[in-house]
Every structure is written in C-alpha cells, then in structure tokens.
C-alpha cells in the first residue's frame, strides 16, 4: 500500500502527533512472544533488568507485561490526507516503574526506571499489519520498529513496505 519511500512518508509526522489525555484508554496484562512463538522474558541481573527472547520449557510460566494504550491525535495538516486521524500508542511495563525504552543511538531496547509522564522513548505506535500479530514502531524514530536480533530485542529500521511484514518485527500478545 506504499510507494517507494512509503514507510518514511507515512510516518513522517509521528514526531508531531500529540497523545490525547494523560491517561490510557485501556490497559491489560499480556505475555509477549515472537512470530515464531519464542517468549520475551525479563530477568533482574546486577540491579538492572535484561530482556531475553527464548524458548520456554513446557510448563514454564510466561512473563507478563502491562500494556497501556493511548490515543494519539494526528491533525489533518500533518496527516497529509486532509482528515484528522488517530493512532494507538502503547507503553510496555514488565514490572512496576520500569518501561521498555527505545535507545535510538544504540539501536537497542532497554528497560528503564522512570516516573510519569513517561518520555517519548517509552511510546510505540501500534500496528497490526499481519493477521493477529502486532508491531511496535518507535514514536521518536519513525520507520524503526522493535524487533528480534540474536535472541535479544533490538531496534530495526524498516525501509520498505514489504519489510513491514518481516517476521522479526511481528509479535503476538496473549492474555493466557
């Protein structure tokens, strides 16, 4: 559904979108897994949290993440199609006071302790480009998505519409 530079074009105004209201429109706990059903897990090591992508043993419990969904308003003068649009933004918190952050300099995904209001690096634009899977695009860096690299979460630049469906940026949410 994009031209050659579609991803850059359709995300160009993400920087300017404003989150309507401070409170999320909905929140719920879910486990996060990859397209290939590996689990995203969080471990406390040396007073900081590490994020892993791994196969769980048969009866091992999946880590849960609190997903908070926010509505982001896109004024028509920015949206490029003459109509006010809304996006879903999400923050992900695996444990109290810690949130996933995009570290754009290091192309990494990190867990940071912080207070509200959360910084823009903690917000991700929600996409469901694939049946029953979601992707998380950095609010601070349009065209860059949370993805899986070497059994860790990393930031992955998506430079064409075909790559929007690449398996390493697709995730499944499950409340069970």
């Amino acid at each position: 559904a994009f031209g050659i530079s579609g991803v850059q074009k359709y995300t160009r105004a993400l920087h300017d979108s404003s989150i309507t209201g401070i409170s999320p429109i909905t929140e719920y706990l879910a486990s996060l897994s990859t397209y290939n059903d590996q689990s995203i897990t969080f471990a406390l090591e040396d007073e900081s949290y590490e994020i892993y992508v791994e196969d769980l043993k048969k009866d091992e419990k999946k880590d849960k993440v609190l997903l908070s969904y926010y509505e982001s308003q896109h004024p028509s003068n920015e949206s490029g199609d003459g109509v006010d649009g809304k996006m879903l933004m999400v923050t992900l918190s695996p444990t109290k006071d810690f949130w996933l952050h995009a570290n754009n300099k290091e192309h990494s995904v990190e867990l940071h302790k912080c207070e509200k209001p959360l910084p823009d690096q903690a917000f991700f634009v929600l996409h469901n480009m694939h049946s029953n899977c979601v992707s998380f695009e950095c609010k601070t860096d349009p065209g860059v998505f949370i993805g899986v690299k070497d059994n860790h979460l990393a930031l992955i630049k998506v430079d064409s519409s075909e790559n929007l469906c690449t398996e390493n940026i697709l995730f499944k949410l499950s409340e069970t």
Partner: antibody, heavy 121, light 107 residues
C-alpha cells in the same frame, strides 16, 4: 471528507465470480485498512477480509478458498472477488475503513453505502 | 474463531427508557470491542470503540462498558432516532466476528 463507494454488477449467475470495487477518497490507503463486510437480506453482518495499511491481506477462513482482495493505489481502489458463488452469497456488500491508522483495534469508523449483489440464474 | 453472543435478540422500549444490550465473547478480547447502530436500508454506524470510547458525533446517552468477555451497551434515555438494530464486534483476532444483532423496537 472521508468517502467509500462500492460498485459492481448487481446480478451474478451461480458458479460465476462476483467482482466489486471500493473507491475511496479523503484518506490514504497507506495509513488505513479497508475491510469488506457482507449482510444477507434480513440477516446479520459477516466480515469477509481486510487490506491492511501495509498491503497485507487477511481473510475470513470460512471464505478463504473463494475470496481475493487486492488494491490499485493509483486509483484509490480496493477490489473484492468471490468465486463459485451460490444463492447463499446474495447480500449487501460493504467496504469500511479502520478507525485508527495502521490498526483495526478501534473498529470501522467509515462505511460505504453498500451494494446489493443477487446471485441468480 | 471467537463467537460473539448478543442478548436480547430484540426488545421493545419506550422513548425515555434506559436500554441495556449485552455481548458475550467466547474468549477474552481485552477491550477490543466495537458497537454499531444500523437503521433499515442504511450502513452500520460506529457508536463505541475500545469497549468504552464514544465515536465522534455520537450522543453521550450512549455508553459502553466491560472487558475480557462481558460487554454492555447502554442507552441512558432512549430517543425516537435510536430505534434500530445494534451489533457488537470483536477486533481482538481475525476473523473480526459480529454478534447476531439486537433489534430495538417501539413499545
């Protein structure tokens, strides 16, 4: 403003292929998913499938073997083809646009007026 | 597929009445539920999305509640233009299934 308009033949013969087009204006197919939904006379709504903003397509598994959704970006059109139709496919066919950019979680905010397709010889 | 069961299938009410329609999902759908209003010969109109959010231009007498598997659409004071059929729809997983509809008729 946002508009969706379905068009296509109102009468299709059994075993033939039903072809409909949804022409959209006031928004970009690169930002919003467009869905096809149908409603048999006097009955409820059935979701057929979606062309998502990224160009991927999802279908209702009950119809998957017979349905094809495609797009023509240059014409701002989304097409629906349903093969091997029977009288049970007689319905009003709607196209509808997602409420949210990039995501279907918010339901369908804008609908076409619908077009009645009758399957009969 | 996720089954959506609406109740009642029809109801008779008077102008000014408080009307409640329920929708039950066969598995959890978080809050990814929409409600639509459809009048005869017209397209459905989005009333509520994300279970509780009022769509643009929808009167505040409409409200939605619920999460998980149990959801409710409430019309606080029924108006003449509210006589229609109402559908719930889950948007948690494809196929995005609808309830069978609730027809609200004049008593």
């Amino acid at each position: 403003q946002v508009q969706l308009q379905e068009s296509g033949p109102g009468l299709v013969k059994p075993s033939e292929t039903l072809s409909l087009t949804c022409t959209v204006s006031g928004f970009s197919l690169s930002k919003y998913g467009v869905h096809w939904i149908r409603q048999p006379p006097g009955k409820g709504l059935e979701w057929i499938g979606v062309l998502r903003a990224g160009g991927t397509i999802s279908y209702n598994s009950a119809l998957m073997s017979r349905v094809t959704i495609s797009e023509d970006i240059s014409k701002s059109q989304v097409s629906l083809k349903l093969s091997s139709v029977t009288a049970a496919d007689t319905a009003v066919y709607y196209c509808a646009r997602d409420h949210y950019y990039y995501s279907s979680f918010g339901g369908f905010a804008s609908w076409g007026q619908g077009t009645l397709v009758t399957v009969s010889s | 597929d996720i089954q959506m069961t609406q109740s009642p299938s029809s109801l008779s009410a008077s102008v000014g009445d408080r009307v409640t329609i329920t929708c039950l999902a066969s598995q959890t759908i978080a809050t990814w539920l929409a409600w639509y209003q459809q009048k005869p010969g017209k397209s459905p109109k989005l009333l509520i999305y994300a279970a509780t959010r009022l769509a643009d231009g929808v009167p505040s007498r409409f409200s939605g509640s619920g999460s998980g598997t149990d959801f409710t659409l409430t019309i606080s004071s029924l108006q003449p233009e509210d006589f229609a059929t109402y559908y719930c729809q889950q948007l948690y997983n494809t196929p995005y299934t609808f309830g069978q509809g609730t027809k609200v008729e004049i008593k």
